[in-house]
């Protein structure tokens, strides 16, 4: 079993979570990747996924979640914009590798979103905010569900948890609307 630690982010409503998940370039560059939430007593739920095969530096938006897979860096960048209190929870990046279970990327993210003023006077958030005002084009993509009955079904305590990853089939039934968004540097 692998010890999974957590990294905690305490943010305010309206702010943007911005994290990067590191992966092995040679093995996973073009693999489909996903952002999941883990709720107490439930299976991890896929909220957004990259295309299959995953495209380099090609942003995919699902609601308020934006995924960008940078093959040259070996990083999946995840942004959750305009955070809401109800977004609080435990999140993880995974790589789909059918027929095996998804490969979890360390570490999990413990997101705590609270109400309150999200910035300082004169603060400037337009580098990310401009992205979401652009009329998007939508396509369909398959986001596999993480449905193995042998997977740990309870979210770990706040510190660490033992998580095993036995081989098993993945149910590829869930279809999610994917929005492609241009990126501005």
């Amino acid at each position: 079993a692998t010890k999974l630690t957590e990294e905690k982010y305490e943010l305010k409503e309206g702010q943007t979570l911005d994290v990067k998940c590191d992966y092995t370039l040679e093995k996973f560059a073009s693999s489909q990747k996903a952002w999941q939430i883990i709720r107490d007593g439930e299976m991890p739920k896929t909220l957004a996924c990259t295309e299959r095969p995953s495209k380099n530096s090609h942003p995919v938006q699902v609601g308020r979640i934006i995924l960008e897979d940078y093959h040259d860096h070996g990083l999946l960048r995840v942004r959750m914009v305009n955070l809401q209190v109800e977004d609080s929870g435990l999140y993880q990046c995974v790589i789909y590798q059918p027929p095996k279970e998804p490969h979890m990327l360390f570490d999990r993210i413990r997101l705590v979103v609270t109400k309150g003023f999200s910035g300082t006077p004169g603060s400037n958030e337009n580098s990310t905010q401009n992205v979401y005002k652009i009329p998007p084009t939508t396509t369909k993509a398959l986001c596999p569900l993480y449905t193995s009955p042998r997977t740990v079904t309870q979210a770990p305590p706040k510190s660490t948890a033992d998580v095993s990853t036995p081989d098993s089939e993945i149910n590829l039934t869930n279809v999610t609307d994917i929005i492609r968004v241009p990126v501005f540097n």
Epitope: K3, T5, E7, Y9, E10, L11, K12, Q15, T16, D18, V19, K20, C21, D22, Y23, T24, L25, D72, H73, G74, L75, L105, F106, D107, I109, N124, E125, N126, S127, T128, N185
Partner: antibody
């Protein structure tokens, strides 16, 4: 307990070379990106180089690009910095630092090793 | 390269008083900002990351705020052990990761 211990510093003449090592314990070394950060005497902090954990991607500050090489040996839990063509302005305390998994911020630091470049 | 500018360079405060340190980025870094404390002869120590999240073991008197280009580190009631140099660092996008030049908090 997380520990990082740098070694390999010392005095060297301009144009010379040094190899710094950082032995780590207390966490799964191979999972995490690691960086070297330096601090010239009486000055502020300057990021020098980073090596990612899983991807192995490497990055360098412009001031050291082409002269310094970062590497790691996951089997030995050790990070390295090979410094060639050293200049007087490279004189500094060199710290190795463990990064967060999710972002390039430095949650654990070693105590540093002093590199002095002087003729 | 994103340039980080801290102010003031030196802050003279009496023990028990509030200290407010500023950090400005040359372009927006979202909330991808960290604060470190460094005492003489020691390595830096992570205080705040994600602009406002306190690192493990950091007392509640330290708080961070801001987003975009303007950030603040507040020490609500300075203790003797808080007199040190404080650095901000951005970790937005890709390297180079850059630090501010530091603010020295000294006893008034």
């Amino acid at each position: 307990e997380v520990q990082l211990l740098e070694s390999g510093g010392g005095m060297v003449q301009p144009g010379g070379s040094l190899r710094l090592s950082c032995a780590v314990s207390g966490f799964t070394f191979s999972r995490y990106a690691m960086s070297w950060v330096r601090q010239a005497p009486g000055k502020g902090l300057e990021w020098v180089s980073e090596m990612r954990g899983s991807s192995g991607s490497t990055y360098y500050a412009d001031s050291v690009k082409g002269r310094f090489t970062i590497s790691r040996d996951n089997s030995k839990n050790t990070l390295y910095l090979q410094m060639n063509s050293l200049r007087v302005e490279d004189t500094a305390i060199y710290y190795c630092a463990k990064e967060f998994s999710s972002n390039s911020l430095f949650d654990y630091w070693g105590q540093g090793t002093l590199v002095t470049v002087s003729s | 390269e994103i340039v980080m500018t801290q102010s003031p360079a030196t802050l003279s405060v009496s023990p028990g008083e509030r200290a407010t340190l500023s950090c400005r980025a040359s372009q927006s870094v979202n909330i991808n900002l960290a604060w470190y404390q460094q005492k003489p002869g020691q390595a830096p120590r992570l205080l705040i990351y994600g602009a406002s999240t306190r690192a493990t073991g950091i007392p509640a008197r330290f708080s961070g705020s801001g987003s975009g280009t303007e950030f603040t580190l507040t020490i609500s009631s300075l203790q003797s052990e808080d007199f040190a140099v404080y650095y901000c660092q951005q970790f937005y996008n890709w390297p180079p990761w850059t630090f501010g030049q530091g603010t020295k908090v000294e006893i008034k």
